[in-house]
């Protein structure tokens, strides 16, 4: 039950995380104009991975796509790549994890196969989450670097009379969405890996032994009471079994809890 819950929760958390990674990747507000110097600007700039936008106080918003591939900064290309890899891995992970879910029966799939699939999807979610976190962090670092560079030469003018105010950019909403989503995907992946351990059939180091009562000296009585016909020194040679204890054979002869849907 706990394994099913862990697996299910891991799947849901990862699903939310991947949806968040997709949302963050598509969002236009990766960087937004810093309003520290002009909090009441009539023109507000913000940028995403795919296009940059300008919102006028008139209410009109104009967005322009980055129609060049070679002209874009290498860091931006790297962030795009990381986010796309994260989405692709996450999507594959989701697909694999659907079939790995304990509550879904597909043909006569073995528990070991489900365990392997759960582990695979878990690893995929972890890598997906790490890609998203890395992508967002690289972009954030790029912003911080550019912010301080533009602050250093914020005002360039002729004789101090005419000022050209350089637009500075700060963290946009997409960065926070990306960090949270990446974290959720990572957590979901870890939960799937934990669930995998519970799904895998336990392998033991000892051989299965079947015990049979030889003669009248051993009696099997359920309920944990020890019973014997003899008293004295010979008792130490007799095999006395707790009714609650089972041999390896007995365990396997019962329907496994993993056989129930």
């Amino acid at each position: 039950m706990a394994v099913t819950a862990c697996q299910g929760l891991g799947f849901v958390v990862s699903l939310i995380g991947i949806a968040g990674i997709i949302a963050a990747t598509c969002m236009d507000q990766w960087s937004t104009q810093d309003l520290y110097n002009n909090p009441v600007t009539a023109v507000f700039n913000y940028q995403g991975l795919w296009r940059s936008c300008v919102r006028e106080s008139s209410g009109f918003t104009e967005c322009r796509g980055y129609f060049t591939l070679l002209g874009l900064p290498a860091m931006l290309q790297a962030v795009r790549a990381l986010m796309i890899v994260g989405i692709v891995l996450g999507a594959i992970g989701l697909l694999v994890s659907i079939f790995a879910l304990k509550c879904i029966r597909i043909g006569s799939m073995e528990d070991s196969a489900k365990a392997n699939m759960t582990l695979t999807s878990g690893i995929m979610f972890i890598v997906s989450g790490l890609c998203a976190i890395a992508g967002v962090s690289v972009f954030a670092n790029m912003l911080v670097t550019n912010f301080w560079m533009s602050t250093a030469n914020m005002y360039t003018g002729m004789g101090g009379m005419v000022q050209t105010v350089q637009t500075r950019y700060t963290f946009g909403a997409a960065l926070f969405v990306g960090w949270v989503a990446g974290g959720l995907t990572l957590i979901g992946g870890v939960m799937m890996c934990i669930a995998c351990r519970g799904l895998a059939p336990e392998e033991t180091n000892y051989k299965a032994v079947s015990y049979h009562a030889s003669g009248h000296s051993v009696a099997y009585k359920p309920g944990g009471f020890k019973a014997s016909t003899g008293f004295g020194s010979n008792t130490k040679n007799k095999k006395i079994y707790d009714g609650g204890a089972r041999t390896e054979d007995e365990v396997q002869s019962y329907p496994s809890k993993h056989d129930y849907v």
Epitope: N38, T41, A42, V43, N45, S52, E56, S57, S58, T167
Partner: antibody
Framework: EVKLVESGGGLVRPGGSLKVSCAAS????????ISWVRQTPEKRLEWVAT????????YYLDSVKGRFTISRDDAKNTLYLQMSSLRSEDTAMYYC???????????WGQGTSVTVSS | NIMMTQSPSSLTVTAGEKVTMSCKSS????????????LTWYQQKPGQPPKLLIY???TRESGVPDRFTGSGSGTDFTLTISSVQAEDLAVYYC?????????FGAGTKLEIK
Amino acid sequence: EVKLVESGGGLVRPGGSLKVSCAASGITFSRYAISWVRQTPEKRLEWVATISSGDSYTYYLDSVKGRFTISRDDAKNTLYLQMSSLRSEDTAMYYCGRLGYGNAMDYWGQGTSVTVSS
Amino acid sequence: NIMMTQSPSSLTVTAGEKVTMSCKSSQSLLNSGNQKNYLTWYQQKPGQPPKLLIYWASTRESGVPDRFTGSGSGTDFTLTISSVQAEDLAVYYCQNDYSYPLTFGAGTKLEIK
């Protein structure tokens, strides 16, 4: 046809209050930001206030901040400018205008005259 | 606040002449996000409210005759009337639409001989 009609202007004593209105027709009023601009007797144009569409965010000229309040009633297609603690320097012709591309006022009303005098 | 300076304050021309008037801002009106200059030109004829002529420094408003041309970038802007007509008698104002407060220039009064 887009039409903006201002009303409510008049003569008021210094320190007094006045509420001017701007009724819009021919436009989806709620979709646009609207501004108030005044023209002094010396013919200088001075932007007074702007109210955005949707969130109704407001912007004011520093000299009117705290004294003037811009508001809108999208259901009535009407813009308001509540003026209080009026001064002689507030004497002007008050125009309302719709903001279009580039934050430019593409449509103007005919204006309403406000005179602050004792 | 961005200061807008217009020159000349007035000019008198004959019909058919080419006219240029200048507008300078104390700060750049060029927005890096879309490479557009947030400068607007208005025309105000006697007894009328101002009328939009040009926005984004060079984009002509629909219905405005093509003899009106806006140019310039950053801090220096120009309005040119290629062949002045009698109906162009008016005061021309430039406005900063980039940063609040949205300041206007003092205007250039165009008179016809």
